[in-house]
Protein backbone atom coordinates (compact mmCIF):
# COMPACT_ATOMS: atom_id res chain seq x y z
CA UNK A 1 0.00 0.00 0.00
CA UNK A 2 2.81 2.42 0.90
CA UNK A 3 4.72 1.54 -2.26
CA UNK A 4 1.98 2.73 -4.60
CA UNK A 5 2.71 6.39 -3.94
CA UNK A 6 5.41 8.30 -5.77
CA UNK A 7 8.57 9.21 -3.86
CA UNK A 8 8.45 12.51 -2.00
CA UNK A 9 11.50 13.91 -3.78
CA UNK A 10 13.88 12.67 -6.42
CA UNK A 11 17.03 11.61 -4.63
CA UNK A 12 18.93 11.47 -7.91
CA UNK A 13 17.62 14.84 -9.12
CA UNK A 14 19.23 18.26 -9.20
CA UNK A 15 18.05 19.46 -5.82
CA UNK A 16 18.25 16.50 -3.45
CA UNK A 17 20.90 13.93 -2.67
CA UNK A 18 20.94 11.05 -0.19
CA UNK A 19 23.17 12.11 2.66
CA UNK A 20 23.06 9.70 5.55
CA UNK A 21 19.48 8.63 6.16
CA UNK A 22 17.56 11.05 3.97
CA UNK A 23 17.44 12.86 0.66
CA UNK A 24 18.55 16.35 1.58
CA UNK A 25 18.39 19.68 -0.19
CA UNK A 26 21.81 21.11 -1.01
CA UNK A 27 23.47 24.19 0.40
CA UNK A 28 23.56 27.58 -1.37
CA UNK A 29 26.77 29.06 -2.78
CA UNK A 30 29.01 30.45 -0.06
CA UNK A 31 27.88 27.84 2.47
CA UNK A 32 29.10 24.37 3.44
CA UNK A 33 27.17 21.36 4.73
CA UNK A 34 27.45 21.29 8.54
CA UNK A 35 24.87 18.53 9.13
CA UNK A 36 22.54 16.63 6.82
CA UNK A 37 18.78 17.01 7.03
CA UNK A 38 16.88 15.19 9.75
CA UNK A 39 13.72 14.44 7.77
CA UNK A 40 12.89 13.18 4.28
CA UNK A 41 13.51 15.84 1.61
CA UNK A 42 14.54 18.30 4.31
CA UNK A 43 16.97 21.19 4.39
CA UNK A 44 20.50 20.47 5.51
CA UNK A 45 22.20 22.64 8.11
CA UNK A 46 24.44 24.94 6.09
CA UNK A 47 26.98 27.44 7.45
CA UNK A 48 28.74 30.38 5.76
CA UNK A 49 32.23 29.59 4.49
CA UNK A 50 34.93 30.81 6.91
CA UNK A 51 37.22 33.66 5.88
CA UNK A 52 39.65 32.86 3.05
CA UNK A 53 37.46 30.01 1.79
CA UNK A 54 34.67 29.86 -0.78
CA UNK A 55 32.12 27.63 -2.56
CA UNK A 56 30.85 28.91 -5.88
CA UNK A 57 28.25 26.22 -6.62
CA UNK A 58 24.56 26.38 -5.85
CA UNK A 59 22.78 23.38 -4.35
CA UNK A 60 25.90 21.42 -3.48
CA UNK A 61 26.58 18.94 -0.68
CA UNK A 62 30.21 19.78 0.11
CA UNK A 63 31.15 19.48 3.76
CA UNK A 64 34.01 21.95 3.48
CA UNK A 65 34.75 25.13 1.56
CA UNK A 66 37.66 25.44 -0.87
CA UNK A 67 40.66 27.51 0.13
CA UNK A 68 40.98 30.80 -1.72
CA UNK A 69 43.97 30.92 -4.04
CA UNK A 70 46.81 33.32 -3.33
CA UNK A 71 48.10 35.26 -6.30
CA UNK A 72 51.71 34.37 -7.16
CA UNK A 73 53.85 37.37 -6.33
CA UNK A 74 56.89 35.65 -7.82
CA UNK A 75 55.03 35.71 -11.15
CA UNK A 76 54.15 39.41 -10.57
CA UNK A 77 50.46 38.54 -10.20
CA UNK A 78 48.02 40.82 -8.37
CA UNK A 79 44.46 40.24 -7.07
CA UNK A 80 42.01 41.81 -9.50
CA UNK A 81 39.09 40.67 -7.30
CA UNK A 82 39.43 39.57 -3.69
CA UNK A 83 38.08 36.21 -2.60
CA UNK A 84 34.51 36.16 -1.30
CA UNK A 85 32.38 33.35 0.16
CA UNK A 86 30.99 32.67 -3.31
CA UNK A 87 33.99 33.28 -5.58
CA UNK A 88 37.70 32.59 -5.60
CA UNK A 89 40.32 35.32 -5.82
CA UNK A 90 40.73 36.52 -9.41
CA UNK A 91 44.41 36.92 -10.14
CA UNK A 92 45.76 38.92 -13.01
CA UNK A 93 48.35 41.51 -13.93
CA UNK A 94 48.60 45.11 -12.85
CA UNK A 95 48.15 47.90 -15.46
CA UNK A 96 51.11 48.01 -17.84
CA UNK A 97 51.65 44.24 -17.58
CA UNK A 98 50.19 41.37 -19.58
CA UNK A 99 49.49 37.65 -19.03
CA UNK A 100 52.05 35.25 -20.43
CA UNK A 101 50.70 31.70 -20.22
CA UNK A 102 53.06 28.97 -18.99
CA UNK A 103 51.42 26.25 -21.08
CA UNK A 104 50.75 26.03 -24.81
CA UNK A 105 47.02 25.25 -24.58
CA UNK A 106 46.06 28.27 -22.52
CA UNK A 107 42.75 28.28 -20.59
CA UNK A 108 41.50 30.56 -17.81
CA UNK A 109 42.85 28.26 -15.09
CA UNK A 110 46.29 27.82 -16.68
CA UNK A 111 49.34 28.97 -14.74
CA UNK A 112 50.70 32.30 -15.92
CA UNK A 113 53.15 35.04 -15.14
CA UNK A 114 52.96 38.76 -15.79
CA UNK A 115 55.26 40.50 -18.25
CA UNK A 116 55.73 44.25 -18.54
CA UNK A 117 54.04 45.64 -21.63
CA UNK A 118 56.08 47.11 -24.42
CA UNK A 119 56.16 50.90 -24.26
CA UNK A 120 55.53 51.89 -27.87
CA UNK A 121 56.26 55.52 -27.02
CA UNK A 122 59.74 54.61 -25.81
CA UNK A 123 60.25 52.84 -29.13
CA UNK A 124 59.01 55.98 -30.95
CA UNK A 125 56.08 54.02 -32.40
CA UNK A 126 52.31 54.39 -32.52
CA UNK A 127 50.34 52.10 -30.18
CA UNK A 128 48.14 49.98 -32.43
CA UNK A 129 46.60 47.68 -29.76
CA UNK A 130 46.79 48.44 -26.06
CA UNK A 131 48.39 45.79 -23.90
CA UNK A 132 45.98 43.71 -21.81
CA UNK A 133 45.63 40.02 -22.58
CA UNK A 134 48.72 40.07 -24.77
CA UNK A 135 51.64 42.37 -25.35
CA UNK A 136 51.22 45.83 -26.86
CA UNK A 137 51.04 45.87 -30.63
CA UNK A 138 53.15 48.77 -31.85
CA UNK A 139 52.51 50.37 -35.22
CA UNK A 140 54.43 52.71 -37.49
CA UNK A 141 56.98 55.25 -36.33
CA UNK A 142 55.77 58.41 -34.64
CA UNK A 143 55.95 61.68 -36.64
CA UNK A 144 59.56 62.89 -36.79
CA UNK A 145 60.86 59.31 -36.90
CA UNK A 146 61.45 56.91 -39.76
CA UNK A 147 61.91 53.12 -40.06
CA UNK A 148 65.50 52.06 -40.02
CA UNK A 149 66.25 48.37 -39.52
CA UNK A 150 64.11 47.19 -36.59
CA UNK A 151 63.74 50.59 -35.02
CA UNK A 152 62.61 54.14 -35.51
CA UNK A 153 65.27 56.77 -36.06
CA UNK A 154 64.79 60.46 -35.43
CA UNK A 155 64.60 62.66 -38.48
CA UNK A 156 67.79 64.70 -38.90
CA UNK A 157 67.52 68.23 -37.59
CA UNK A 158 69.84 69.70 -40.22
CA UNK A 159 70.85 69.06 -43.78
CA UNK A 160 74.23 67.89 -42.61
CA UNK A 161 73.06 64.38 -41.71
CA UNK A 162 72.49 61.70 -44.27
CA UNK A 163 68.84 61.00 -45.08
CA UNK A 164 68.20 57.78 -46.98
CA UNK A 165 65.20 57.36 -49.24
CA UNK A 166 62.83 56.27 -46.45
CA UNK A 167 64.01 59.17 -44.35
CA UNK A 168 63.41 61.61 -47.14
CA UNK A 169 59.90 60.24 -47.69
CA UNK A 170 59.00 60.61 -44.04
CA UNK A 171 61.08 63.56 -42.97
CA UNK A 172 60.59 65.62 -46.13
CA UNK A 173 64.31 65.88 -46.87
CA UNK A 174 65.81 65.16 -50.24
CA UNK A 175 68.62 62.68 -50.21
CA UNK A 176 71.91 64.54 -49.63
CA UNK A 177 75.16 63.55 -51.35
Amino acid sequence: QGGTRSPRCDCAGDFHKKIGLFCCRGCPAGHYLKAPCTEPCGNSTCLVCPQDTFLAWENHHNSECARCQACDEQASQVALENCSAVADTRCGCKPGWFVECQVSQCVSSSPFYCQPCLDCGALHRHTRLLCSRRDTDCGTCLPGFYEHGDGCVSCPTSTLGSCPERCAAVCGWRQMF
Epitope: Q1, R8, G20, L21, E39
Partner: antibody, heavy 122, light 111 residues
Amino acid sequence: EVQLVESGGDLVKPGGSLKLSCAASGFSFSAYAMSWVRQTPEKILEWVATISDGDPYTYYPDNVKGRFTISRDNARNNLYLQMSHLRSEDTAIYYCTRERNDYDQYYTMDYWGQGTSVTVSS
Amino acid sequence: DIVLTQSPASLVVSLGQRATISCRASKSVSTSGYNYLHWYQQTPGQPPKLLIYLASNLESGVPARFSGSGSGTDFTLNIHPVEEEDVATYYCQHSRELPWTFGRGTKLEIK
Protein backbone atom coordinates in the same frame (compact mmCIF):
# COMPACT_ATOMS: atom_id res chain seq x y z
CA GLU B 1 17.54 -15.69 9.54
CA VAL B 2 18.23 -12.16 10.80
CA GLN B 3 19.90 -12.13 14.20
CA LEU B 4 21.06 -9.25 16.41
CA VAL B 5 22.92 -10.12 19.59
CA GLU B 6 23.84 -7.36 22.05
CA SER B 7 26.58 -7.56 24.68
CA GLY B 8 28.55 -5.32 27.03
CA GLY B 9 25.82 -4.29 29.47
CA ASP B 10 26.94 -3.89 33.05
CA LEU B 11 26.55 -2.04 36.36
CA VAL B 12 28.49 1.23 36.16
CA LYS B 13 28.93 4.23 38.45
CA PRO B 14 27.58 7.68 37.47
CA GLY B 15 30.12 9.48 35.30
CA GLY B 16 31.51 6.17 34.09
CA SER B 17 31.81 4.73 30.58
CA LEU B 18 30.65 1.57 28.85
CA LYS B 19 30.81 0.17 25.33
CA LEU B 20 27.97 -1.96 23.98
CA SER B 21 28.34 -4.27 20.98
CA CYS B 22 25.84 -5.84 18.63
CA ALA B 23 26.75 -8.79 16.42
CA ALA B 24 24.58 -8.93 13.29
CA SER B 25 24.03 -11.92 11.02
CA GLY B 26 21.62 -13.25 8.40
CA PHE B 27 21.53 -10.10 6.24
CA SER B 28 23.79 -7.73 4.32
CA PHE B 29 24.80 -5.62 7.32
CA SER B 30 26.52 -2.80 5.39
CA ALA B 31 23.35 -2.12 3.35
CA TYR B 32 21.25 -1.12 6.37
CA ALA B 33 21.08 1.80 8.74
CA MET B 34 21.26 0.57 12.33
CA SER B 35 20.00 2.02 15.60
CA TRP B 36 20.12 1.69 19.35
CA VAL B 37 16.85 1.99 21.26
CA ARG B 38 16.57 1.73 25.04
CA GLN B 39 13.76 0.75 27.39
CA THR B 40 13.74 2.29 30.84
CA PRO B 41 12.67 0.39 34.00
CA GLU B 42 9.30 2.18 33.54
CA LYS B 43 9.02 0.45 30.13
CA ILE B 44 9.40 3.71 28.19
CA LEU B 45 11.04 3.25 24.76
CA GLU B 46 13.58 5.88 23.70
CA TRP B 47 15.50 6.20 20.47
CA VAL B 48 19.20 6.59 21.36
CA ALA B 49 21.26 6.69 18.14
CA THR B 50 21.26 5.80 14.45
CA ILE B 51 24.07 5.28 11.98
CA SER B 52 23.37 5.34 8.25
CA ASP B 53 24.52 2.86 5.65
CA GLY B 54 27.10 4.00 3.08
CA ASP B 55 29.21 6.96 4.23
CA PRO B 56 28.26 6.69 7.87
CA TYR B 57 26.40 9.68 9.25
CA THR B 58 25.34 9.53 12.89
CA TYR B 59 22.22 10.89 14.59
CA TYR B 60 21.36 11.35 18.27
CA PRO B 61 18.62 12.90 20.40
CA ASP B 62 19.73 15.90 22.45
CA ASN B 63 19.80 14.03 25.77
CA VAL B 64 22.70 11.76 24.66
CA LYS B 65 24.44 13.98 22.08
CA GLY B 66 28.08 14.51 23.04
CA ARG B 67 28.01 11.59 25.50
CA PHE B 68 27.18 8.62 23.26
CA THR B 69 28.87 7.58 20.02
CA ILE B 70 27.42 5.03 17.60
CA SER B 71 29.79 3.33 15.18
CA ARG B 72 29.90 0.29 12.93
CA ASP B 73 32.41 -2.20 11.56
CA ASN B 74 31.01 -3.51 8.29
CA ALA B 75 33.85 -6.01 7.89
CA ARG B 76 32.93 -7.67 11.19
CA ASN B 77 29.14 -7.06 10.97
CA ASN B 78 29.27 -5.27 14.31
CA LEU B 79 27.47 -2.23 15.69
CA TYR B 80 28.76 -0.35 18.73
CA LEU B 81 27.56 2.22 21.25
CA GLN B 82 30.23 3.98 23.26
CA MET B 83 28.62 5.61 26.30
CA SER B 84 30.42 8.07 28.57
CA HIS B 85 29.48 10.49 31.38
CA LEU B 86 26.73 8.03 32.27
CA ARG B 87 23.82 9.20 34.41
CA SER B 88 21.25 7.32 36.48
CA GLU B 89 18.61 8.11 33.83
CA ASP B 90 20.64 6.09 31.29
CA THR B 91 19.68 2.92 33.21
CA ALA B 92 17.80 0.77 30.70
CA ILE B 93 17.79 -2.29 28.48
CA TYR B 94 19.60 -1.31 25.27
CA TYR B 95 18.34 -2.87 22.05
CA CYS B 96 20.18 -3.03 18.76
CA THR B 97 17.74 -2.59 15.84
CA ARG B 98 17.88 -2.80 12.08
CA GLU B 99 16.34 0.09 10.15
CA ARG B 100 14.34 -0.86 7.10
CA ASN B 101 13.70 1.79 4.49
CA ASP B 102 13.06 2.18 0.78
CA TYR B 103 13.19 5.05 -1.69
CA ASP B 104 10.23 6.63 0.12
CA GLN B 105 12.60 7.43 3.00
CA TYR B 106 10.52 6.03 5.80
CA TYR B 107 12.44 4.17 8.48
CA THR B 108 11.06 1.45 10.70
CA MET B 109 12.80 -0.88 13.13
CA ASP B 110 12.02 -4.23 11.60
CA TYR B 111 14.36 -6.42 13.69
CA TRP B 112 15.37 -6.10 17.35
CA GLY B 113 17.96 -7.94 19.43
CA GLN B 114 17.15 -9.38 22.86
CA GLY B 115 18.78 -6.39 24.57
CA THR B 116 21.58 -5.86 27.08
CA SER B 117 21.04 -4.36 30.54
CA VAL B 118 22.86 -1.19 31.65
CA THR B 119 22.51 -0.02 35.26
CA VAL B 120 24.00 3.30 36.33
CA SER B 121 24.17 3.48 40.11
CA SER B 122 26.62 4.34 42.83
CA ASP C 1 10.06 16.99 19.34
CA ILE C 2 6.86 15.23 18.29
CA VAL C 3 5.06 13.81 21.32
CA LEU C 4 2.94 10.69 20.80
CA THR C 5 0.10 10.23 23.31
CA GLN C 6 -1.37 6.74 23.53
CA SER C 7 -4.74 5.93 25.05
CA PRO C 8 -5.84 4.11 26.99
CA ALA C 9 -2.78 3.28 29.11
CA SER C 10 -4.28 -0.17 29.70
CA LEU C 11 -7.12 -2.11 28.18
CA VAL C 12 -9.01 -5.24 29.25
CA VAL C 13 -10.88 -7.02 26.46
CA SER C 14 -12.77 -10.30 26.28
CA LEU C 15 -11.50 -13.02 23.95
CA GLY C 16 -12.94 -12.58 20.46
CA GLN C 17 -13.81 -8.92 21.05
CA ARG C 18 -12.27 -5.82 19.44
CA ALA C 19 -9.40 -3.90 21.01
CA THR C 20 -8.91 -0.31 19.85
CA ILE C 21 -5.77 1.65 20.73
CA SER C 22 -5.33 5.33 19.87
CA CYS C 23 -2.13 7.27 19.16
CA ARG C 24 -2.26 11.05 18.86
CA ALA C 25 0.72 13.12 17.63
CA SER C 26 1.47 16.66 18.81
CA LYS C 27 2.16 17.57 15.16
CA SER C 28 1.27 15.92 11.86
CA VAL C 29 3.41 12.91 11.01
CA SER C 30 1.97 12.73 7.49
CA THR C 31 3.33 14.37 4.37
CA SER C 32 2.95 13.85 0.60
CA GLY C 33 0.58 10.95 1.11
CA TYR C 34 2.82 9.14 3.59
CA ASN C 35 1.88 8.49 7.21
CA TYR C 36 5.16 8.04 9.09
CA LEU C 37 3.58 6.15 12.00
CA HIS C 38 4.38 2.55 12.99
CA TRP C 39 3.06 0.10 15.59
CA TYR C 40 5.06 -2.41 17.68
CA GLN C 41 3.99 -5.25 19.95
CA GLN C 42 6.02 -6.25 23.01
CA THR C 43 5.09 -9.48 24.77
CA PRO C 44 6.44 -10.07 28.30
CA GLY C 45 10.20 -10.79 28.37
CA GLN C 46 10.62 -10.13 24.65
CA PRO C 47 11.90 -7.19 22.59
CA PRO C 48 9.37 -5.12 20.61
CA LYS C 49 8.26 -6.56 17.27
CA LEU C 50 7.13 -4.56 14.24
CA LEU C 51 3.40 -5.03 13.54
CA ILE C 52 2.33 -2.23 11.18
CA TYR C 53 4.36 0.32 9.23
CA LEU C 54 3.25 3.54 7.55
CA ALA C 55 0.02 3.55 9.60
CA SER C 56 -1.78 0.76 7.74
CA ASN C 57 0.72 -1.69 6.19
CA LEU C 58 0.79 -5.10 7.85
CA GLU C 59 4.32 -6.45 8.39
CA SER C 60 4.77 -9.88 6.83
CA GLY C 61 3.87 -12.74 9.15
CA VAL C 62 1.54 -10.57 11.24
CA PRO C 63 -2.03 -11.97 11.45
CA ALA C 64 -4.74 -10.13 9.54
CA ARG C 65 -6.71 -9.51 12.75
CA PHE C 66 -4.33 -6.56 13.28
CA SER C 67 -5.10 -3.41 11.31
CA GLY C 68 -4.03 0.21 11.42
CA SER C 69 -5.60 3.41 10.19
CA GLY C 70 -5.34 7.18 10.46
CA SER C 71 -3.44 10.13 9.07
CA GLY C 72 -2.10 13.50 10.18
CA THR C 73 -2.19 13.43 13.98
CA ASP C 74 -4.74 10.69 14.79
CA PHE C 75 -4.00 6.99 14.40
CA THR C 76 -5.68 3.77 15.53
CA LEU C 77 -4.59 0.17 16.00
CA ASN C 78 -7.41 -2.38 15.91
CA ILE C 79 -7.20 -6.03 16.96
CA HIS C 80 -10.24 -8.14 16.12
CA PRO C 81 -10.92 -10.77 17.20
CA VAL C 82 -8.57 -10.58 20.20
CA GLU C 83 -6.74 -13.83 21.01
CA GLU C 84 -4.87 -15.00 24.10
CA GLU C 85 -1.45 -14.51 22.44
CA ASP C 86 -2.21 -10.80 21.92
CA VAL C 87 -1.59 -10.04 25.58
CA ALA C 88 1.20 -7.50 25.24
CA THR C 89 2.10 -3.82 25.37
CA TYR C 90 1.58 -1.92 22.11
CA TYR C 91 3.67 1.12 21.15
CA CYS C 92 3.29 3.63 18.35
CA GLN C 93 6.39 5.32 16.88
CA HIS C 94 6.89 8.04 14.28
CA SER C 95 9.72 8.52 11.78
CA ARG C 96 8.50 11.80 10.29
CA GLU C 97 11.59 13.67 11.51
CA LEU C 98 14.39 13.29 14.01
CA PRO C 99 14.24 12.68 16.91
CA TRP C 100 12.09 9.61 16.42
CA THR C 101 9.80 9.13 19.41
CA PHE C 102 7.54 6.42 20.83
CA GLY C 103 4.22 6.52 22.62
CA ARG C 104 4.26 5.43 26.27
CA GLY C 105 2.51 2.16 25.44
CA THR C 106 -0.88 0.54 25.94
CA LYS C 107 -1.06 -2.68 27.94
CA LEU C 108 -3.64 -5.15 26.61
CA GLU C 109 -5.06 -7.78 28.97
CA ILE C 110 -7.68 -10.46 28.47
CA LYS C 111 -10.81 -10.47 30.66
